[in-house]
């Protein structure tokens, strides 16, 4: 047993050197170790092949260390492994792509607040058995097509706090177990109209705190299994282009956080699911250049860079060009609310609302989530009032799921070591 | 700096109830979990009950089921754990606590991080 | 319930010493597991989460591991002010779970 260690058998053949001042790997480690915890100390770099003899590992915690650089042969003969946790590695900001090959049992991936930039090109290829992959509190910029491809089993993606722009068509392809995506705190302003499209098992999708001035429901429709959806804390802008998001949300019987506008500027802090649906009228023209929304249609309908319903009928163009200027009767949405987008009838009356960081609690949904922000910051926005909690229960033995962000008995108490639920 | 603040000690008679307050300052309660532990004098540490922030709701230990409720007033941003029908060996500090978990990333990782000082209760007659 | 054991109920060594105080789950708890000091009269202080992460503030001497149903908290070094109880709890699912308690004493 290496001398900064501890090494024992059981239950698990174990070697254990947390936050003893290492800064390398140590040599020695038992063969037969099934679990190695390095995390705390100084290590730097993990040198190729550094645990090739531990063939029997399943857990390798190498978190709060200060790794810049993993060879990529690293993990080399871990056939194994289950757990590798490389979190709060700030220095680390990039990681080979083929650091990961062979982990074909690895099904729980720590890379949070590693400082990543950019994820190259097959990191994940060949995790056909990841179910949690943790990317949270990264500098993370794009998602690049096909990245998590391979991850079919996959059903925790946290890709929060991080400096993501856009959700390109192809960024969550072939994610076809995914149960909760949570990119929230980034900077998203574009959606493409199918970036959902293989998430038919979604369940939770956080988009609060980012730049999103729109978002097409046709990246939405997918969402069969959607039940929690935070929109909240985005630069809504609640004119004529917002009518079908509007029309899908008065049909969503999920729980959904509230939708504050912030365009045009009479509507400005209203929840965009409260409005009346002539209240979308017209178009509101920030200052600044427009960026405008991936529809999906042929830009011939968007002659000015505009969706259709925002371009001006010829004696109407200052409404749309002048901002501050009330928008016009005449400018409001051509004919109504498009096929299959109309709201429902007045049978259910208004929605109750719940503290945003809860959201919307319709009568027939489960019971909201909760917010989950990075660690020690504050949440935005936060209400000081309002209502906020169900009656008790003494379901006493429910497990908490692997992030507690599931439904009602959703965990189990797992197996071995594993750290899903 | 967030703190939980507890209402002073008191001296109640077997059959009575009691109610303890937790102020939070430095923070919105409805941004909390808040939960509530207790220790009996030289005994340990024993979970009552708080806020599930996963199911949206108040769990508490099947010990006190029935006997306890806990309450919040976010416009004053207090907490408070209410014990009826009190016996002696309800002689204990009572502390509120906040859970961690809930303000963790996706990680989620669940611990009372801050707590309060402790409200002494005497039971006797 | 989950029952937590910590074991030895009570340990005496020197400055400067290494300690280990072990926990025990009667089931599978993953990673999810805490551990608190308390000094007399104060409230519990929170040292390590989710077995291995140390609370800010919290001295590098003390270090968390473990996973499954047994977990270990060291102290490296011991220092005076060490002197203390120290629990941990379960936090895989409710009720919230601690374990018994180790009394720490300085030599």
């Known amino acids: 047993c290496p001398g900064a260690c501890v090494c024992y058998n059981e239950p698990k053949v174990t070697t254990s050197c947390p936050q003893q001042g290492l800064q390398a790997v140590p040599v020695g480690i038992p063969a037969a170790s099934q679990r190695i915890f390095l995390h705390g100390n100084r290590i730097s770099h993990v040198p190729a092949a550094s645990f090739r003899a531990c063939r029997n590992l399943t857990i390798l915690w190498l978190h709060s260390n200060v790794l810049a650089r993993i060879d990529a042969a690293a993990f080399t003969g871990l056939a194994l492994l289950e757990q590798l946790d490389l979190s709060d590695n700030a220095q680390l900001r990039s990681v080979d792509p083929a650091t990961f090959h062979g982990l074909g049992r690895l099904h729980t991936l720590h890379l949070d607040r590693c400082g990543l930039q950019e994820l190259g090109p097959g990191l994940f290829r060949g995790l056909a058995a990841l179910q949690y992959l943790y990317l949270q509190d990264n500098a993370l910029q794009a998602l690049p097509d096909d990245t998590f491809r391979d991850l079919g089993n996959l059903t925790h993606l946290f890709l929060h706090g991080n400096r993501i722009s856009s959700v390109p068509e192809r960024a969550f392809r072939g994610l076809h177990s995914l149960d909760r995506l949570l990119l929230h705190q980034n900077r998203v302003a574009h959606v493409h109209p199918h970036a959902f499209r293989d998430l038919g098992r979604l369940m939770t999708l956080y988009l609060f705190a980012n730049n999103l001035s729109a978002l097409p429901t046709e990246a939405l429709a997918p969402l069969r299994a959607l039940q929690y959806l935070r929109l909240n804390d985005n630069p809504w802008v609640c004119d004529c282009r917002a009518r079908p998001l509007w029309a899908w949300l008065q049909k969503f019987r999920g729980s959904s956080s509230e939708v504050p506008c912030s365009l045009p500027q009479r509507l400005a802090g209203r929840d965009l699911k409260r409005l009346a649906a002539n209240d979308l009228q017209g178009c509101a023209v920030a200052t600044g250049p427009y960026h405008p929304i991936w529809t999906g249609r042929a830009t011939d309908e968007e002659p000015l860079g505009l969706p259709k319903c925002c371009q001006p009928d010829a004696a109407d163009k200052a409404s749309v060009l002048e901002p501050g200027r009330p928008a016009s009767a005449g400018n409001a949405l051509k004919g109504r609310v498009p096929p299959g987008d109309s709201p429902p009838g007045n049978g259910s009356g208004p929605r109750h609302i719940n503290d945003s960081p809860f959201g919307t609690l319709p009568g027939s949904a489960e019971p909201p989530l909760t917010a989950v922000r990075p660690e020690g910051s504050e949440p935005p926005g936060f209400p000081t009032s309002g209502p906020r909690r169900r009656p008790g229960c003494s379901r006493k033995n429910r497990t908490r799921s692997h992030c507690r962000l599931g439904q009602a008995g959703s965990g189990g108490g797992g197996t071995g070591d594993s750290e899903g639920s | 700096q967030m703190q939980l603040v507890q209402s002073g000690a008191e001296v109640k008679k077997p059959g009575a109830s009691v109610k303890v307050s937790c102020k939070v300052s430095g923070y919105t309660l409805s941004g909390l979990s808040i939960h509530w532990v207790r220790q009996a004098p030289g005994k340990g540490l024993e979970w009552m009950g708080g806020?599930?922030?996963?199911?949206?709701?108040?769990v508490y230990a099947q010990k006190f089921q029935g006997r306890v409720t806990l309450t919040d007033d976010t416009s004053t941003d207090t907490a408070y754990m209410e014990l009826s029908s009190l016996r002696s060996e309800d002689t204990a500090v009572y502390y509120c606590a906040r859970d961690l978990g809930y303000l963790t990333s996706g990680n989620y990782y669940d611990a009372f991080d801050i707590w309060g000082r402790g409200t002494m209760i005497t039971v006797s007659s | 319930d989950i029952q937590m054991t910590q074991s030895p109920s009570s340990v005496s060594a020197s400055v400067g010493d290494r300690v280990t105080i072990t926990c025990r789950a009667s089931q599978d708890i993953n990673r999810w597991l805490a551990w608190y000091q308390q000094k007399p009269g104060k409230a519990p202080k929170l040292l390590i989460y989710a077995a291995s992460r140390l609370q800010s503030g919290v001295p590098l001497r003390f270090s968390g591991s473990g996973s499954g149903t047994d977990f270990t908290l060291t102290i490296n070094s011991l220092q005076p002010e060490d002197s203390a109880t120290y629990y941990c709890q379960q936090t895989n699912n409710f009720p919230r779970t601690f374990g018994q308690g180790t009394r720490l004493e300085i030599k």
């Open positions: 806020f599930d922030s996963e199911d949206d709701e108040t």
